[in-house]
């Protein structure tokens, strides 16, 4: 239930960006909600979705921007350390999670071209890894003025402080529950069969369960699809192949935190679904 007790920054840099696209971008996440976006073209950290309305201190977004500009400089500097032909994609996952006892557990790991290769060692206060690329980048970053100290501060102090602030100031966003709007439709499939599709739209949080019943008995969960919407909500669907003419024996059951109890969704009449 406390899946939102984490603050994670997903950082990505590319050595050869396409024209007009950023070389570096970041998404910031409070649990399953994206609250921040940043890219090297705009150069400003900006709130996402409902977090635009969060009652934050005046300098909050300036501080996020300052920190991410430092990260941008480091990430792009990494490509100089790597040399070679490339192209390279460097990713970072930085952040913290609050444990049950309210202590903060930091995360700092890095991947090159999709392979995890380096982390930030909190005890040593340095970046480290066994691979040559980890060595190349960590040496370069270590040479940057106070970079390791800034990383330590970011992970051990800034991140948990921000997370606790968001838990207080943005509690409404974090406790947001949006029940799904539902549809159950049938369409012809291969000869003698139909596909039933149970769709859930605009719900939050993302945890949702869809299953089919036939004459009140479990008929499986079908083949599923799930994804985010631009407003921070989610959509999901599940499809089941049934015999033609048998469609009306089926219904779909949805369970979600925004619903007081499981909701039964009946098949739409052909006239309504046109």
């Amino acid at each position: 239930a406390e899946s939102h007790l984490s603050l994670l920054y997903h950082l990505t840099a590319v050595s050869s960006p396409a024209p007009g696209t950023p070389a570096f971008w970041v998404s910031g996440w409070l649990g399953p909600q994206q609250y921040l976006s940043y890219n090297s073209l705009r150069g400003e950290a900006e709130p996402c979705g409902a977090w635009v309305w969060e009652n934050q201190v005046s300098w909050y977004w300036e501080k996020e921007t300052t920190d991410l500009r430092i990260k941008e400089k480091l990430f792009l500097e990494a490509f100089k350390a790597l040399g070679g032909k490339g192209p390279y994609t460097l990713q970072g996952l930085l952040g913290c999670e609050l444990g049950p006892d309210n202590t903060s557990v930091p995360t700092a790991k890095f991947a090159l071209n999709g392979e995890e290769f380096m982390n930030f060692d909190l005890k040593q206060g340095t970046w480290g890894g066994d691979w040559p690329e980890a060595l190349a980048i960590s040496q370069r970053w270590q040479q940057q003025d106070k970079a390791a100290n800034k990383e330590l501060t970011f992970l051990l102090f800034s991140c948990p402080h921000r997370l606790r602030e968001h838990l207080e100031r943005g509690r409404g966003n974090l406790e947001w529950k949006e029940p799904p709007s539902m549809r159950l439709k049938a369409r012809p499939s291969s000869p003698g069969f139909s596909v039933l599709t149970c769709s859930a739209f605009s719900f939050y949080p993302p945890e949702l369960q869809l299953r089919f019943l036939r004459n009140g008995l479990a008929a499986g969960t079908g083949q599923g699809d799930f994804g985010p919407n631009s407003d921070g909500s989610f959509h999901a669907s599940s499809s089941l192949t049934v015999k033609s003419g048998d469609e009306h024996h089926y219904c779909c059951i949805v369970q979600h935190a925004g619903l007081a109890q499981p909701l039964r969704v009946e098949l739409e009449s052909p006239a309504k679904s046109s």
Epitope: A81, L82, G83, G84, K85, G86, L112, N113, G114, E115, D130, W131, P132, E133, L135, A136, Q139
Partner: antibody, heavy 118, light 106 residues
Framework: QVQLQESGPGLVKPSETLSLTCTVT?????????WHWIRQPPGKGLEWIGY???????NYNPSLKSRVTISRDTSKNQFSLKLSSVTAADTAVYYC???????????WGQGTLVTVSS | EIVLTQSPATLSLSPGERATLSCSAS?????MHWFQQKPGQSPRLLIY???NLASGIPARFSGSGSGTDFTLTISSLEPEDFAVYYC?????????FGQGTKVEIK
């Protein structure tokens, strides 16, 4: 075109130190490659030993770490392998290789056979 | 460390036949590389990052796979393809090689 050439004694006595050098031609140690030693006992598979990066940093196979040292001489465009306290089990063809783009070994030396025997 | 197991140990085929070599990893890896080695020669890179053909390698060689199971395929064996083939991973430290598959003339 980059070429690698291993050199060193072909016979080493047990408990002594094996020393090999790899000479790199067509490239100088300046830009983002790593340089590796790999060995192959007669009739067997390949075993990675360790690397030195263009930056000068090194790392070794945990199974050999206590006995291995890899170093370089940029003025001669060479990097070297030292393996101490050798036994008959260290008899192998030793290859030097370059790792391209932090992905794969694209250039190999022709290999040199080192026999450990008294 | 990740152990790579190649099968079969030996593959006896005739020129023109299709060769399928397998490499199984003890844990999931992102990519696999393949090398060819002929007697008295050093290994030569054939396929990098699972499916990319190295420079100068003929198109009859192809690679595929993901997770723990990877395959090298030679669509139609030429006389010069009879050699030992090794898979290699560098997803998990240290880098490791398979024990090799020998492709011999039947």
């Amino acid at each position: 075109q980059v070429q690698l050439q291993e050199s060193g004694p072909g016979l080493v006595k047990p408990s002594e130190t094996l020393s090999l050098t790899c000479t790199v031609t067509g490239y100088s140690f300046t830009s983002g490659y790593s340089w590796h030693w790999i060995r192959q006992p007669p009739g067997k598979g390949l075993e990675w030993i360790g690397y030195i990066h263009d930056s000068g940093g090194t790392n070794y196979n945990p199974s050999l770490k206590s006995r291995v040292t890899i170093s370089r001489d940029t003025s001669k465009n060479q990097f070297s392998l030292k393996l101490s306290s050798v036994t008959a089990a260290d008899t192998a063809v030793y290859y030097c290789a370059r790792e391209e783009n932090y992905r794969y070994f694209d250039v190999w030396g022709q290999g040199t056979l080192v026999t450990v025997s008294s | 460390e990740i152990v790579l197991t190649q099968s079969p140990a030996t593959l006896s085929l005739s020129p023109g036949e299709r060769a399928t070599l397998s490499c199984s990893a003890s844990s999931s890896v992102s990519y696999m590389h393949w090398f060819q080695q002929k007697p008295g020669q050093s290994p030569r890179l054939l396929i990098y990052s699972t499916s990319n053909l190295a420079s100068g390698i003929p198109a009859r060689f192809s690679g595929s796979g993901s997770g723990t199971d990877f395959t090298l395929t030679i669509s139609s064996l030429e006389p010069e393809d009879f050699a030992v083939y090794y898979c290699q991973q560098r997803s998990s430290y240290p880098p490791t090689f398979g024990q090799g598959t020998k492709v011999e003339i039947k």
